[in-house]
Interface confidence: medium
């Protein structure tokens, strides 16, 4: 039996100390927030250029329009993350050409192609949840058998432990039972 540290739940991706869940179903922006909250996460709030590059790549590779936790719902033209933090000046460069354009009440931000776009919040899109990776103290180490020893940091998408499995199942259950048109 190996003692392994798995910082992220099954089906989640590890990057720079955080875990990310890229949905396989679609929800509107508000329901995407709820989906993330239900698994102890948050609709993704981007904190660095490296994180943005990583997430943009995931989104563009899969060719999906994907919600992030950014909107100007509180005040038109003032973009704010779901954690209450403002959009930093350097992040404005991620908007696609001519965006945000607020055509027809477009108040929520999505990954679109190589940058960001604003779109109507009631549209169903894929979403990304983010939460801190497990610290992997001795009490949190999981027993998995058999398994090879993993290098540090563990590979993306690795996971382990009953809590992780339940969380992954919870996401899967919601994805199969919530249909938004």
């Amino acid at each position: 039996t190996e003692r392994l540290c798995h910082p992220c739940p099954w089906e989640w991706t590890f990057f720079q100390g955080n875990c990310y869940f890229m949905s396989n179903s679609q929800r509107n922006w508000h329901d995407s927030i709820t989906a993330c909250k239900e698994v102890g996460a948050q609709l993704v709030v981007i904190k660095s250029a490296e994180e943005q590059n990583f997430l943009q790549l995931q989104s563009s590779r899969s060719n999906r329009f994907t919600w992030m936790g950014l909107s100007d719902l509180n005040q038109e033209g003032t973009w704010q993350w779901v954690d209450g933090s403002p959009l930093l000046p350097s992040f404005k460069q991620y908007w696609n050409r001519g965006e945000p354009n607020n055509v027809g009440e477009e108040d929520c931000a999505e990954f679109s192609g190589n940058g960001w776009n604003d779109d109507k919040c009631n549209l169903a899109k894929f979403w990304i949840c983010k939460k801190s990776a497990a610290s992997c103290s001795r009490d949190e180490e999981q027993f998995l058998s058999p398994a090879p020893a993993t290098p540090n940091p563990p590979p993306a998408g690795s996971g382990g432990g009953l809590n992780d499995i339940f969380e992954a199942q919870k996401i899967e259950w919601h994805e199969h039972h919530h249909h938004h048109h």
């Epitope: 250029a49 000046p89 350097s90």
Partner: antibody, heavy 122, light 106 residues
Framework: QVTLRESGPALVKPTQTLTLTCTFS??????????VSWIRQPPGKALEWLAL???????YYSTSLKTRLTISKDTSKNQVVLTMTNMDPVDTATYYC??????????????WGRGTLVTVSS | DIQLTQSPSTLSASVGDRVTITCRAS??????LAWYQQKPGKAPKLLIY???SLESGVPSRFTGSGSGTEFTLTISSLQPDDFATYYC????????FGQGTKVEIK
């Protein structure tokens, strides 16, 4: 054709307020992603970014000079104005305005004015 | 604030030489870096943006590379028109310039 042109006094006295105007053509500061910035260069020295104003009227200032600077825009006139208070001889420099393009490749400066030399002396 | 340090400050080279200028950032700026060329009495001219993207109309002998904290501008074969001062500029967090590298005739 896109152009930017700086205008303002060539000479100001110490403690006075400097007002510079950037008049541009070929683009609109109401277009998403477009910004106009002020950058200066003392004689024989490096470039120093001063201030930037976005299409949505967000304003950003150099941390070391923010108490002295004010940037504003008049979209209808295609102008951006910079005021700098309490001028000192060390503020003698060529002052440039420059444009930040629209798009998701970053907020660099793709087009510059020719610059205007401002001398601070009594 | 993010500081940019260019090296060398001055570079003596001949026509046809391969020239490399380095720019180091005080913290990671991903690939949000631009390079400019400036000639005496003239405004800076954009050469490279996003660390390695060549601005339209700029000769292909200019190439940019790097990410994170270390970046380079390379001129593959120096031409008479290339003797100038070169500046790097970051736009990851506000905007700052390097102190410049003067490329002069050897």
């Amino acid at each position: 054709q896109v152009t930017l042109r700086e205008s303002g006094p060539a000479l100001v006295k110490p403690t006075q307020t400097l007002t510079l105007t950037c008049t541009f053509s070929g683009f609109s500061l109401s277009t998403s992603g477009i910004s106009v910035s002020w950058i200066r260069q003392p004689p024989g020295k490096a470039l120093e970014w001063l201030a930037l104003i976005d299409w949505d009227d967000d304003k950003y200032y150099s941390t070391s000079l923010k108490t002295r600077l004010t940037i504003s825009k008049d979209t209808s006139k295609n102008q951006v104005v910079l005021t700098m208070t309490n001028m000192d001889p060390v503020d003698t420099a060529t002052y440039y305005c420059a444009r930040t393009p629209s798009g998701s490749y970053g907020r660099y400066f793709d087009l510059w004015g020719r610059g205007t030399l401002v001398t601070v002396s009594s | 604030d993010i500081q940019l340090t260019q090296s060398p400050s001055t570079l003596s080279a001949s026509v046809g030489d391969r020239v490399t200028i380095t720019c180091r950032a005080s913290q990671s700026i991903s690939n949000w870096l631009a390079w400019y060329q400036q000639k005496p009495g003239k405004a800076p001219k954009l050469l490279i943006y996003k660390a390695s993207s060549l601005e339209s109309g700029v000769p292909s002998r200019f190439t940019g590379s790097g990410s994170g904290t270390e970046f380079t501008l390379t001129i593959s074969s120096l031409q008479p028109d290339d003797f100038a001062t070169y500046y790097c500029q970051q736009y990851n967090s506000y905007w700052t310039f390097g102190q410049g590298t003067k490329v002069e005739i050897k």
